[in-house]
Interface confidence: low
């Protein structure tokens, strides 16, 4: 399985309730020797890997903020976070969330959801999801929380810049052509005058009149702006999606290690010839 975050940025006005969500994709094992822990904590945006640092959410550590599987009853510690405006929820389809009630700017930060697969009490795999919560101070900053993807806004910004550059280029083209045309006119007028002068001074000697127009000082050099294709191809930031415990691991983790099935090896696909 893997962990995804539907949204990577939540912007909330002070006093609102913020519900941050993670989702587990693929079947998940909670067999007799396999346990799945889902929890939340605050972290910081590390240079190499996000979610490395563990900080409590409203003084509750990740041990206090565990989601319990549908078949197990929550223990007493599960109720305590609710008194501090923290609520955990999960459903049968892998969605799990933490709700922070009555948010303040102090709640702002990078929130990480962590899913740990334990086999015989030993961590087998860790999956992370991360999202940024920005709490805007003051009551006049809006009525509800807005959830979005930073990746989306990045690509939208890139597209907007590219589009803007194109429009500016198209609008400026006639002006540039006009200026070039006028410059050439001035140059050819000068040359005509020179020729007349020469003709009057030294008759019979021709001037080849090289058409090397001097560079126009107002025109920007092409190298100062990257080509549009570069702007459009800018990669969106990862923002913590599908991050595993080891930064070198691939983004799509291997299948679960698993199920009601603790010990058996993965079975290869049946050959297509067996399909009926």
């Amino acid at each position: 399985f893997k962990v995804t975050t539907p949204y990577s940025l939540y912007v909330c006005p002070e006093g609102q309730n913020a519900t941050l969500t993670c989702r587990i994709l693929g079947p998940v094992s909670k067999g007799h020797d396999v346990t799945i822990y889902k929890t939340w904590y605050l972290s910081s945006r590390g240079e190499v890997q996000m979610c490395k640092e563990h900080r409590p959410i409203r003084n509750f550590t990740l041990q206090h903020l565990q989601h319990h599987g549908s078949h197990l009853k929550a223990n007493a510690s599960h109720d305590q976070p609710q008194k501090h405006g923290l609520e955990l929820a999960s459903d049968h389809h892998g969605n799990f969330s933490i709700t922070l009630r009555n948010v303040t700017p102090r709640d702002s930060g990078l929130y990480c959801c962590l899913v740990i697969e334990l086999k015989n009490h030993h961590p087998e795999q860790r999956f992370y999801g991360s999202m940024e919560l920005q709490v805007q101070a003051g009551k006049g900053s809006g009525s509800t929380c807005m959830a979005s993807n930073e990746q989306d806004s990045d690509s939208i910004t890139a597209a907007a810049l590219a589009t803007g550059a194109c429009i500016v280029g198209i609008l400026c083209l006639p002006l540039i052509l006009l200026l070039v045309y006028k410059q050439r006119q001035v140059a050819s007028h000068r040359r005509a005058q020179e020729l007349v002068r020469m003709d009057s001074n030294t008759q019979g000697i021709e001037n080849p009149g090289f058409e090397t127009t001097p560079p126009f000082q107002g025109m920007p050099e092409a190298k100062t702006r990257p080509p549009l294709s570069y702007v459009a191809q800018r990669q969106p930031s990862e923002s913590g999606r599908y991050l595993l415990s080891d930064p070198s691991t691939p983004l799509s983790p291997p299948g679960p290690g698993d199920v009601f099935f603790p010990s058996l090896d993965p079975v290869p696909d049946s050959p297509n010839s067996e399909a009926i």
Epitope: G26, P27, G69, S70, H71, D258, V259, F260, P266, P268
Partner: antibody, heavy 121, light 112 residues
Amino acid sequence: QVQLVESGAEVKKPGASVKVSCKASGYIFTDYYMHWVRQAPGQGLEWMGVINPYDGRTSFAQKFQGRLTVTRDTSTSTAYMDLSGLRSEDTAVYYCAKQMGIWDYDAFDIWGQGTMVTVSS
Amino acid sequence: QFVLTQPSSVSGAPGQRVIISCTGSSSNIGAGYDVHWYQQLPGTAPKVLIYGNSDRPSGVPDRFSASKSATSASLAITGLQAEDEADYYCVAWDDSLKAYVFGTGTKVTVLG
């Protein structure tokens, strides 16, 4: 819509093997466990085993260990149940059933139409 | 084979209320595992009626309800109707058998 279509009825001799297929459609095959349940004529339901289509891992009821093989073909979204060493008491309707949620121990929300397997000499 | 015990049959007149019990042990219902209920109409595949102890899938009438206590569960059908005549099975995961265990099944007969 979500559905499971099983292969047709089979008549087998004692000691032989039977392979029943179950083709899934209308949902992401690898996202939900697939179970096999059987029902002998006039009897109750009996859970046989389960496969995780995501990675092919399986688990079986103790009674069927060694005789039951469950596989899947993700390219065709099909699960297969292979029961060997057939005996007369294996005469039953065999159902495949999709699990409802992604968690262990969830209910089975979609069932195949059933495949009647008759073991007779 | 059948670890969950159900009454073999219950009956009631149309409009009546019937209750089907499902008794387990400390390794299944008592261990906290969810109980699910299935309805099997004659000649058809089972259909999930209740999942997760008491939740009803969409399309299942609210005449059907279920609850769970220590090591047992029960299914109630209120306002019994002719189309409710079917076999009913409870099921839960058993931690010692490492398998889903079905109840023995209960045949519901609508009188009249």
